[in-house]
């Protein structure tokens, strides 16, 4: 997992957005379940424009997107790889 060197936060996301991020601009998604000092699920998205953002895990568009990506990954290489990892 990528970690920031200058922060002691157990949770990586200090704030989240709920606005829609289009699948076409997503490069990578990481879903981190609660654990290791962070009591909440965190969803981090890396975009093709070299941005990294935290997304509200409860956002309906995100749930749809994750289902879409995971269903595609069953049949082909996913456009946006999803990784589910525990915090390091």
């Amino acid at each position: 997992i990528l970690e920031a060197h200058y922060t002691n936060l157990k949770c990586r996301c200090s704030g989240v957005i709920s606005t829609v991020v289009g699948l076409n601009i997503i490069d990578r998604i990481q879903v981190t379940p609660p654990g290791n000092g962070c009591p909440k699920t965190e969803v981090v998205i890396w975009t093709k424009m070299k941005k990294v953002i935290c997304v509200n895990p409860r956002a309906k568009w995100l749930q749809r997107l994750l289902r879409h990506v995971q269903s595609k990954s069953l049949s082909s290489t996913p456009q946006a790889p999803v990784s589910k990892r525990r915090a390091a």
């Epitope: 990528l2 970690e3 920031a4 060197h5 200058y6 922060t7 936060l9 990586r12 996301c13 200090s14 704030g15 957005i17 990578r28 965190e42 981090v44 890396w46 424009m49 070299k50 941005k51 990294v52 953002i53 935290c54």
Partner: antibody
Framework: QVTLKESGPEILQPSQTLSLTCTFS??????????VGWIRQPSGKGLEWLAN???????YYNPSLINRLTISKDTSNNQAFLKITNVDTTDSATYYC??????????????WGQGVMVTVSS | DIQMTQSPSSMSASLGDRVTITCQAS??????LVWFQQKPGRSPRPLIY???NLANGVPSRFSGRRSESDYSLTISSLESEDMADYHC?????????FGAGTKLELK
Amino acid sequence: QVTLKESGPEILQPSQTLSLTCTFSGFSLSPYGMGVGWIRQPSGKGLEWLANIWWDDDKYYNPSLINRLTISKDTSNNQAFLKITNVDTTDSATYYCVRSELVMPYVPFDYWGQGVMVTVSS
Amino acid sequence: DIQMTQSPSSMSASLGDRVTITCQASQDIENDLVWFQQKPGRSPRPLIYYATNLANGVPSRFSGRRSESDYSLTISSLESEDMADYHCLQFKQYPYTFGAGTKLELK
């Protein structure tokens, strides 16, 4: 420990090309999310972002200078480069090499070199 | 491009004073803002990220807040080592843009 060091000419003449090198250690430009950029600061003035290059060779430039800037990298030698063509006296500044890493929380320009002072003078 | 209007451009204050520096964004940057401190003859270093979060090793007298498009950096009780230039940076979108900087001097 992360370090970056800039090198280049101290003085050059108007219309020449400025070539800067950033040599870094403590990280590599290979892994996902790693980037190096250039920022300049004229003496006594504010900071101006110039360009970024990322691990995947994606490049971003300041639109006000895009026709004069070229950023590149040599991943195996831990170096990044910036060329500025057709310089004039307004390009006189301290040039900083900076690192960015796409981690969350994301802090662009988390490490800076010491800077190299460049003077354009006829 | 997003313009960052930083004020004041310079200020003098006494030790122990409460000092506030402001950057106003020309459009919504959704907290994508970093404050940098630059001591004389040195390179800048990050102080505050995402508008309100203290970088590691930064004293708690520094704080950041947001009020709509205005982002502020406050030093609650000024110390001599705080004499420096302060710069805000928006990274909401390219091109990344800095404020013009604030020079903080001792009164």
